[in-house]
């Protein structure tokens, strides 16, 4: 091989050993009988050499560096050539390096022809082995802008004070052009500007300078995104670290088309904008770091460009034509507002009228679609009223409290489905019978299902909450005196899978005077926890509640109260509890405002627990928690 470098070309060629391999035999550069492992050729030199092995590409790499000085004379702008031509070089992995030095006031722009560049992170490699490593300069410090492959969106990179561009070509790659040109620009007054062009749908992952190490202190870096107007862009931060700031705050700023508050300032920990139409800029601003403990600022983010979300092209039919007295509202979940700008998240009726809230009413079919970067930002609340006006017609009539499948198929999470159950006053009462026995939610035995039923009085003047109930317990039915609301509340997206476990039937039954009666059929396996309604606020004044507790013939039930005293202090009347054996009618009466609560008691037959409140003084409410446990009978007492 012969390499001759013209004088004044400012080119240096270096041939050196590449990555260590486990090859059995080393290879050398042979130059006038000397065996060496590194050869440097400078401008004006001509050197003839050979290799001592057949496959030098397995051992050596070649670096061709051209220094371009824009300080002392005019800059050679325009398309950059590969010099010396790749055909004149040995077939080794080649790295062409262009080191451009310029004044601080001069902006330099690298322009990449098609294909554009795609940034890669640490540990990643390019499929074709062709990589572009770009770095800039702040005074004497080298700053890595990034490493890039072909076939991406990065079209231009603007810097000032100098740029170092390294193009790595594998030994077998036929490429013989640099693929970029250099242009001069006015000062950009920041570390760099990276332009990313989207022709259509796609995504780009980009990183702050020096990633994964720290972004230079108090610097500014901007990404300009060119996005067709008919597409939408969303930004998400994949990874970031904040440094310890002494002055100023690390932040990102967006110039978003159509925003009246440009620039929009975000913290790195904020949810970033989505659903942006057209071009926008994103800038990362560092701070003055604490000298003792600077920490590092770094950011890796993704820009996703797509047609207005896939969901917006999907039409969902919500058929409420057979429903009566029902309304469905799709609305944003409540979130803490930590900033001014919130990316659009809309629900559209007939794909035309879009708003952040939409209420659909019964009696017709509705076609809806979504225009939203993240549908988990929305939820659904449904209300349905089942009322009886004529007690003769309603008595013994049953209704199934089931979420319609149309609603379950929507891509938005159901939050609450509330049934308002209304009965004629003093004429009828209600009974709720679940498909699966229910467990009452208590601190001692919390519900861990994806949904619960919240049962509360629906009489405006009455503050009575019976409790939260979920499938998988011992409560067979709940009877209530008058109007109630039953709310199915979901707690996890897995409700979709567990929807089959829902199922509650409401029946209108003859009127009774007690506020509520719980029928409990405990399982032998577990302890049943029960608590009085309105837990934490106390059973309302003069309210009476009962539990009908079944005990199988071969079992004995242990009734345990979790306090020594009820704690209630009566202003008027008496608070009492009656425990009555159903078979013998034998009963024990306890004065809750005076007596201690009973010690654990054993019941061989089904029994009632009835609790009736007085009018308590404020702050001395009636709250009771008790449990029932079944164990096999050891002696037959019948």
């Amino acid at each position: 091989f012969e390499i001759a470098l013209p004088r004044e070309s400012n080119i240096t060629v270096l041939i050196k050993l590449g990555t260590p391999t486990l090859l059995a035999k080393p290879c050398y550069i042979v130059i006038s009988k000397r065996h060496i492992t590194m050869l440097s050729i400078k401008s004006g030199e001509r050197i003839v050499f050979t290799f001592s092995c057949q496959s030098p590409e397995n051992h050596f790499v070649i670096e061709i560096q051209k220094n371009i000085d824009c300080m002392s004379g005019p800059c050679p702008f325009g398309e950059v050539q590969l010099q010396p031509s790749t055909s004149l070089l040995p077939t080794l992995n080649r790295t062409f390096i262009w080191d451009v030095k310029a004044h601080k006031s001069i902006g330099l722009e690298l322009q990449f022809s098609i294909p554009r560049l795609r940034q890669i992170g640490p540990g990643e490699s390019c499929p074709d082995g062709v990589t572009h490593s770009i770095s800039g300069r702040i005074d004497a410090t080298v700053v890595r802008i990034g490493t890039f492959c072909s076939n991406g969106t990065v079209s231009r990179i603007k810097m000032q004070e100098g740029v170092k561009m390294a193009l790595h070509l594998p030994w077998f790659h036929p490429r013989n052009v640099s693929g970029f040109s250099i242009a001069n620009r006015s000062s950009i007054k920041r570390l760099c500007i990276i332009e990313s062009v989207f022709e259509g749908e796609g995504s780009a992952t980009l990183m702050s300078a020096n990633y994964p190490e720290g972004f230079p202190e108090d610097e500014l870096m901007t990404w300009q995104f060119v996005v067709p107007a008919h597409l939408r862009a969303s930004v998400s931060f994949l990874n970031f670290n904040l440094s310890n700031c002494e002055r100023k705050e690390e932040r990102v700023e967006y110039y978003i088309p159509g925003s009246t508050t440009n620039p929009e300032v975000f913290k790195l920990e904020d949810k970033q904008p989505g659903n942006m139409a057209g071009n926008f800029n994103l800038s990362l601003q560092g701070c003055d770091q604490d000298a003792q403990s600077p920490g590092i600022l770094r950011l890796q983010f993704q820009v996703l460009v797509q047609h207005p979300q896939n969901e917006s092209n999907k039409i969902y039919v919500v058929d409420l034509s057979n429903e009566r007295a029902m309304s469905l509202t799709i609305e944003p979940r409540p979130v803490k507002q930590s900033r001014k700008f919130v990316p659009g998240c809309f629900v559209c009726l007939e794909s035309r009228t879009c708003s952040s809230n939409l209420t659909l009413t019964s009696g017709s079919k509705h076609k809806i679609s979504f225009l939203c970067d993240d549908l988990t930002r929305l939820w659904m609340n449904v209300e349905k009223t089942i009322s009886c006006t004529d007690h003769r017609y309603c008595q013994r009539k049953s209704y199934s409290l089931q979420v319609p499948s149309d609603i379950l198929h929507l891509p938005v999470e159901l939050h609450d489905f509330s049934w308002k159950l209304l009965v004629p006053k003093d004429r009828l009462s209600l009974v709720l019978v679940p498909a699966q026995k229910l467990q009452q939610h208590t601190h001692e035995k919390p519900c861990n299902t994806s949904f619960s039923y919240l049962v509360a009085s629906a009489i405006p003047s009455q503050d009575l909450y019976f409790g939260s109930f979920c499938p998988g317990g011992s409560i067979k039915q709940i009877q209530v005196k008058q109007n109630i609301s039953v709310t199915l509340r979901t707690f996890a997206p897995s409700f979709q899978q567990e929807a089959s476990r829902q199922g509650l039937t409401v029946s209108f039954i003859p009127y009774f005077k007690e506020e509520g009666v719980f029928t409990v059929t405990p399982d032998t396996k577990s302890k049943v926890y029960l608590r009085t309604p309105n837990w934490d606020r106390g059973l309302p004044s003069l309210t009476s509640v009962s539990w009908n507790i079944s005990v199988p013939r071969d079992q004995v039930a242990c009734l345990t109260f979790f306090k020594e005293r009820s704690g209630v202090v009566c202003q008027t009347g008496r608070a009492f509890m009656i425990i009555q054996e159903q078979r013998t009618r034998a009963e024990e009466i306890f004065s809750l405002d005076e007596d201690v609560l009973p010690k654990p008691s054993f019941h061989h037959h089904s029994f009632w627990v009835n609790i009736s409140n007085c009018s308590p003084t404020s702050g001395k409410q009636l709250d009771l928690l008790f449990s029932v446990t079944l164990t096999p009978r050891t002696v037959d007492l019948t």
Partner: antibody, heavy 116, light 108 residues
Framework: EVQLVESGGGLVQPGGSLRLSCAAS????????MHWVRQAPGKGLEWVAS????????YYADSVKGRFTISADTSKNTAYLQMNSLRAEDTAVYYC?????????WGQGTLVTVSS | DIQMTQSPSSLSASVGDRVTITCRAS??????VAWYQQKPGKAPKLLIY???SLYSGVPSRFSGSRSGTDFTLTISSLQPEDFATYYC??????????FGQGTKVEIK
């Protein structure tokens, strides 16, 4: 597995001689540069001599030129350092090293003490 | 002869610190500089060759760079096992081969 084992060190009087051996295994020394590097007690590293057995080329530090001779026996896969006219300042741990990606493998070292 | 002037001769640092050691060649040695780590009573170990190439098996927190005749070894986040003495060496087949004086990295 590449290994280098030095031997032949010891106590010798000024003006005396010693021959150090460096037995190599796991590679063929004829294809590599072999070096001797020494380190006086509490001091830094000092290159002593090199040989490229394939061509027989040898190189020496000025401080040992004419007194030390580096050689290699490719059949035994061993490099040698013959040290004559030893001086007190030659007291050091002598390491032999193989060079390709710089000095990529080193022996454990052998101590040479020159003292009367 | 090519002199390799290494600085500092010693430094104190804590685990997690970024440590930089520099070597200046008295004349051009291209990229033919290697860096070694040596612990007391042990032989040196190769860390970096050709100024910036990481030798196999060496943790990536070690890196080397070159600017003209100035060479730098950087340990990005010092670990307990990194407390040792570090040497630079020019190896551009320009004899004699020369080492820097060494930099002792001690625990602060």
């Amino acid at each position: 597995e590449v290994q280098l084992v030095e031997s032949g060190g010891g106590l010798v009087q000024p003006g005396g001689s010693l021959r150090l051996s460096c037995a190599a295994s796991g590679f063929n020394i004829s294809s590599y540069y072999m070096h001797w590097v020494r380190q006086a007690p509490g001091k830094g590293l000092e290159w002593v001599a090199s040989i490229y057995p394939y061509s027989g080329y040898t190189y020496y530090a000025d401080s040992v030129k004419g007194r030390f001779t580096i050689s290699a026996d490719t059949s035994k896969n061993t490099a040698y350092l013959q040290m004559n006219s030893l001086r007190a300042e030659d007291t050091a741990v002598y390491y032999c090293a193989r060079a390709y990606y710089a000095m990529d493998y080193w022996g454990q070292g052998t101590l040479v003490t020159v003292s009367s | 002869d090519i002199q390799m002037t290494q600085s500092p001769s010693s430094l104190s640092a804590s685990v997690g610190d970024r440590v930089t050691i520099t070597c200046r060649a008295s004349q051009s040695v291209s990229s033919a500089v290697a860096w070694y780590q040596q612990k007391p009573g042990k032989a040196p170990k190769l860390l970096i060759y050709s100024a910036s190439s990481l030798y196999s098996g060496v943790p990536s927190r070690f890196s080397g760079s070159r600017s003209g005749t100035d060479f730098t070894l950087t340990i990005s986040s010092l670990q307990p096992e990194d407390f040792a003495t570090y040497y630079c060496q020019q190896s551009y087949y320009v004899y004699p081969i020369t080492f820097g004086q060494g930099t002792k990295v001690e625990i602060k």
